[in-house]
Interface confidence: low
């Protein structure tokens, strides 16, 4: 087989690769960096001009079972006087993550990777004004 | 581990917890959601705490491309379009799970990896520390 060019995303398949049935992939769910912690500024969800709350969703057939979702508290943004300014908008910021879904079909169990869209917080934006002719 | 409800009629030999290694179907559910934040919204430009998006590419990871946010300013943009340093732009960080090829370069063998990404920025009131 030809050796791939540098910068190419096609590698030789090492002979040491584990055998995997067609249509499947082997996934070790022992998480690398499991104990890594988020080091965000303190209480930014309540100090933000677009504050948000957190909700924990729990699903025993999902790994990880807990996924935290943020919800913006206001439609507008909080101004210097602590009042809601509806000339600005609080909007959600979202990020994809992967989860493993466990599916039961009768007594057999299968596993499926799933992309989940997580709302991680909110930001304050200038609204887009649509002018009607 | 995570306890899984089991059909009471199934044999007891089934493990209630997620096993350490699983065989996963290659088709990722919801895989076609938009992964490029520049295409999905322009919040990064319209925010009072705007950010730039930096492409982080790693062929040994899935997804191979992740976009990292970097706040453009220390302060926030005020109504006049100027930077107000009485407020702070701070990154919103999130732990996400990705797949890491293990062993390296193998096409269909992965391990879950937790990585920390900055997703965007938000404008906050600063914490003022008064020195006695």
């Amino acid at each position: 087989r030809k050796i791939p060019k540098v910068g190419h995303t096609f590698f030789q398949k090492p002979e040491s690769c584990p055998p995997v049935p067609g249509g499947s992939m082997k996934l070790d769910i022992g998480i690398i960096n499991e104990n890594q912690r988020v080091s965000m500024s303190r209480n930014i969800e309540s100090r933000s001009t677009s504050p948000w709350n957190y909700t924990v969703t729990w699903d025993p057939n999902r790994y990880p079972s807990e996924v935290v979702q943020a919800q913006c508290r206001n439609l507008g943004c909080i101004n210097a006087q602590g009042k809601e300014d509806i000339s600005m908008n609080s909007v959600p910021i979202q990020q994809e993550t992967l989860v493993v879904r466990r599916k039961h079909q009768g007594c057999s169990v299968s596993f499926q990777l799933e992309k989940v869209l997580v709302t991680v917080g909110c930001t304050c934006v200038t609204p887009v004004i649509h002018h009607v002719q | 581990g995570i306890t899984i409800p089991r059909n009471p009629g199934c044999p007891n030999s089934e493990d209630k917890n997620f096993p350490r290694t699983v065989m996963v179907n290659l088709n990722i559910h919801n895989r076609n959601t938009n992964t490029n934040p520049k295409r999905s919204s322009d919040y990064y430009n319209r925010s009072t705490s705007p950010w730039n998006l930096h492409r982080n590419e790693d062929p040994e990871r899935y997804p191979s491309v992740i976009w990292e946010a970097k706040c453009r300013h220390l302060g926030c943009i005020n109504a006049d379009g100027n930077v107000d340093y009485h407020m702070n732009s701070v990154p919103i960080q999130q732990e996400i799970l990705v797949l890491r090829r293990e062993p390296p370069h193998c096409p269909n063998s992965f391990r879950l990896e937790k990585i920390l990404v900055s997703v965007g920025c938000t404008c906050v009131t600063p914490i003022v520390h008064h020195v006695a």
Partner: nanobody, 122 residues
Framework: EVQLVESGGGLVQPGGSLRLSCAAS??????MGWLRQAPGKEREFVAA????????YYADSVKGRFTISRDNSKNTLYLQMNSLRPEDTAVYYC?????????????????WGQGTLVTVSS
């Protein structure tokens, strides 16, 4: 810029066979794949093949029935489809890749043909 043109689609009865072809012009790629989209559904991975033709990957739903192959001298990709089922009805697309990475993810394919319709019905 690579151009991809699929052909060989059509109406076939359940249990029948079809052979799809995809003619590539322009730059040749290490890997290519077939993906399909049924009405109202997401585009899904069917099969992929490395540049040399040594490595092939199949979706569970087509394994043992479909065979992907390529003829590099003709710059052509093929999909031999046997034992067709009604659920195989879809528009089939040929697409290029920078490698056999994440073959199952439609977002990882770079160039797409216009598609060829396969209808399996009695």
């Amino acid at each position: 810029e690579v151009q991809l043109v699929e052909s060989g689609g059509g109406l076939v009865q359940p249990g029948g066979s079809l052979r799809l072809s995809c003619a590539a012009s322009g730059r040749t790629y290490d890997a290519m794949g077939w993906l399909r989209q049924a009405p109202g559904k997401e585009r899904e991975f069917v099969a992929a093949i490395s540049g040399s033709g040594d490595d092939t990957y199949y979706a569970d739903s087509v394994k043992g029935r479909f065979t992907i192959s390529r003829d590099n001298s003709k710059n052509t990709l093929y999909l031999q489809m046997n034992s067709l089922r009604p659920e195989d009805t879809a528009v089939y697309y040929c697409a290029t890749r920078r490698g056999l990475y994440y073959v199952w993810d439609a977002n990882d394919y770079e160039n797409w043909g216009q598609g060829t319709l396969v209808t399996v019905s009695s």
